[in-house]
């Protein structure tokens, strides 16, 4: 692959990564595909510092991240280990709530209005954040 040395136009550089913040909403899978076509992935939050950076840019708006449990266990889209990694769930979340009446539970994670995380129905049209790393050869993101 080709190495990226600077962020594309309209992306924000932070700590050797580039971030793109949507201003419209998509279902989680559509947002995931959008980022993949940009040779990026839905944002993977690996630290409190990155959490605060993303939170600052998205404001108090529900926003998808690259975390889901559609195949069972919670997984980050770039393969970052979930169990040992950073987490910022709201109290009593994730709860895989079935009471929404939309069928199934809640398999996709998003930032809530206060920045903490919640699991929700993946079809909800939330905003999203794409992330790509600088100085790293582009490669195909892992399949879900």
């Amino acid at each position: 692959g080709s190495e990226r040395t600077c962020c594309p136009v309209n992306w924000v550089e932070h700590e050797r990564s580039c971030y793109w913040f949507s201003r419209s909403g998509k279902a989680w899978a559509d947002a995931d595909n959008y980022c993949r076509l940009e040779d990026a992935h839905l944002v993977v939050v690996t630290s409190w510092e990155e959490q605060k950076f993303v939170q600052h840019h998205i404001g108090p708006v529900n926003t998808w991240m690259g975390l889901h449990d559609q195949n069972g266990p919670w997984k980050w889209v770039d393969g970052t280990d979930y169990e040992t990694g950073f987490k910022n769930w709201r109290p009593e979340q994730p709860d895989d709530w079935y009471g929404h009446g939309l069928g199934g539970g809640e398999d996709c994670a998003h930032f809530t209005d206060d920045g903490r995380w919640n699991d929700d129905v993946c079809q909800r049209p939330y905003r999203w954040v794409c992330e790509t790393e600088l100085d790293k050869a582009s490669q195909e993101p892992p399949l879900l």
Epitope: G1, S2, P8, V9, N10, S24, G25, K26, A27, D30, N33, Y34, R36, L37, E38, D39, P125, S138, Q139, E140, P141
Partner: antibody
């Protein structure tokens, strides 16, 4: 000048294979997602496939999934479409198209097209 | 998959006329809507992206509007070179899909 030039179109029998090429010039090829779009004789436009700038991600129309493969060689500034198990309904002019800025911004540059005819 | 429809499928107009073409998506696509012009035997030409943004080099008589599911392409004063087929296309999600086209011919 930004330019796309398709080649490889031909007449082929049903079940046969063909590889189309699209040579790009005048822009930083690896920075843009690229698509194939086709148009059957007398019909409208049908999107076929898209590939990201690095070639790492690609998506297909249901009508070609499992039969067609999109790829690119950024060192040669060339886009490809490998077409297998061809059917009569694949007969069309095939255009390659460049995405405007991002992969969801529409196609701002089109090639002149190459004709694929599937017939026995 | 998102289905796109256009109306009318064809229309006859005269030079100087104001022409409006509508495009509808089967679900909300925000403003991920593009318009193309295709003259007979030629490759499509990009006119408008993001529902209302005019592509560089496209005459200002072309304009687009709409959001969600309903969109419009307007040609304020039809010129001889505008007689062609016009397609809308959604780029909200793959598979990207085109409308069936609207043919604008001379009255």
């Amino acid at each position: 000048e930004v330019q796309l030039l398709e080649s490889g179109g031909d007449m082929v029998q049903p079940g046969g294979s063909l590889r189309l090429s699209c040579a790009a010039s005048g822009f930083t090829f690896s920075s843009y997602a690229m698509s194939w779009v086709r148009q059957a004789p007398g019909k409208g436009l049908e999107w076929v496939s898209v590939i990201s700038g690095s070639g790492g991600s690609s998506f297909y129309a249901d009508s070609v999934k499992g039969r067609f493969t999109i790829s690119r060689d950024n060192s040669k500034n060339t886009l490809y479409l490998q077409m297998n198990s061809l059917r009569a309904e694949d007969t069309a002019v095939y255009y390659c198209a460049k995405d405007r800025v991002r992969a969801h911004d529409g196609f701002d540059i089109w090639g002149q097209g190459t004709m694929v005819t599937v017939s026995s | 998959d998102i289905q796109m429809t256009q109306s009318p499928s064809s229309l006859s107009a005269s030079v100087g006329d104001r022409v409006t073409i509508t495009c509808r998506a089967s679900q909300s696509i925000s403003n991920y809507l593009n318009w193309y012009q295709q003259q007979t035997g030629k490759a499509p030409k990009f006119l408008i992206y993001a529902a209302s943004s005019l592509q560089s080099g496209v005459p200002s008589r072309f304009s687009g509007s709409g959001s969600g599911t309903d969109f419009t392409l307007t040609i304020s004063s039809l010129q001889p070179e505008d007689f062609a087929t016009y397609y809308c296309q959604q780029s909200y999600s793959t598979p990207f899909t085109f409308g069936p086209g609207t043919k604008v011919d001379i009255k």
